[in-house]
């Protein structure tokens, strides 16, 4: 029986050009974690395997960094990075757990907009 739960950072926002850490945490289970997959809208970004460690998909190597922990760091963010991200935990004997994070990448901060358009 699957007793575990995944806690995620939920809905997050970050600035274009910046970086963000995606984090998931599996709790309430003693299941062995075989692997964690990170996906963005049907694309595999990275894998953290219990035996082999990290594998980053070639098309994301420049902008994705492993960690911290089982998390994933996205760098040099663009507006196109806005969307759903999923952490998929492969465990035994429970099976597969999925967590969802929604990332919104903003053009620039409100503070910058305010400064740029200040009336003298």
């Amino acid at each position: 029986m699957m007793t575990g739960t995944i806690e995620t950072t939920g809905n997050i926002s970050a600035e274009k050009g910046g970086s963000i850490i995606l984090q998931c945490h599996l709790s309430s289970t003693t299941a062995q974690v075989t692997q964690v997959n990170w996906e963005q809208q049907d694309q595999l970004l990275a894998i953290c395997n219990a035996d082999l460690g990290w594998h980053i998909s070639p098309s994301f190597k420049d902008r994705v960094a492993p960690g911290p922990g089982l998390g994933l760091t996205l760098q040099s963010l663009t507006v196109n990075d806005t969307g759903e991200y999923f952490c998929i935990y492969h465990t035994y004997p429970d099976g597969t757990y999925t967590g969802r994070i929604f990332l919104e990448v903003l053009e620039s901060s409100v503070a910058e907009h305010g400064a740029r358009f200040q009336i003298p």
Epitope: Q32, T34, Q35, A50, D51, L52, D94, G95, T96, T98
Partner: antibody
């Protein structure tokens, strides 16, 4: 080209033991999770065992736990299934399978080796 | 254990037909559903994984869909080489389990 070639299937008496082998080629064997899946005479498919890429973890269904042992030799690119205390219900065609790196599915299967448990 | 049910054990269709094979899980499997093809000679190939992702080298006439407990495999334009038995498999919860198979034959 990915190739998985099973061997070792024979006729064995109930209570007996048997070791199946699967020779892998055409890919970096040590990077992949591997499994054994069997097909019964009634054509039902059943997952039998799984081993992680480095051999650190092994997983089994209750039906074979304590009787079957999956292992691997990454230097020789061979997957094994040691079967003991065999029962008539273990009669099946045994397939060696490779898992996708994502672990979502088994992407390559061997041709199978036949095991018959009968007195 | 999760039971996987393929209610149609065999079906006959004509070449060029659109064929749909269904699979039902006894509980929600969150799209962790795969489809395999077994040819009459016993050769097994992965067609679709994670409900709708086409495995590399598989013709685009194959597609998968579904959610929750109900899933389907569609062959949009049946060809002679598609004569085979099709199995679904869930990868949500151990032990991973398979459907009983659906044999596709030519009318």
């Amino acid at each position: 080209e990915v190739q998985l070639v099973e061997s070792g299937g024979v006729l064995v008496k109930p209570g007996g033991s048997l070791k199946l082998s699967c020779a892998a080629s055409g890919f970096t064997f040590s990077n992949y999770v591997m499994s054994w899946v069997r097909q019964t005479p009634e054509k039902r498919l059943e997952w039998v065992a799984t081993i992680t890429s480095g051999g650190t973890y092994t997983y089994y269904p209750d039906s074979v736990k304590g009787r079957f042992t999956i292992s691997r030799d990454n230097a020789k690119n061979i997957l094994y299934l040691q079967m003991s205390s065999l029962r008539s219900e273990d009669t099946a065609l045994y397939y060696c399978t490779r898992w996708l790196l994502s672990l979502y599915a088994m992407d390559y299967w061997g041709q199978g080796t036949s095991v018959t448990v009968s007195s | 254990d999760i039971q996987m049910t393929q209610t149609t054990s065999s079906l006959s269709a004509s070449l060029g037909d659109r064929v749909t094979i269904t699979c039902r899980a006894s509980q929600d499997i969150s799209n962790f559903l795969n489809w395999y093809q077994q040819k009459p000679d016993g050769t097994v190939k992965l067609l679709i994984y994670y409900t709708s992702r086409l495995h590399s080298g598989v013709p685009s006439r194959f597609s998968g869909s579904g959610s929750g407990t109900d899933y389907s495999l569609t062959i949009s334009n049946l060809e002679q080489e598609d004569i085979a038995t099709y199995f679904c498999q869930q990868g949500k919860t151990y032990p991973y389990t398979f459907g009983g198979g659906t044999k596709v034959e030519i009318k």
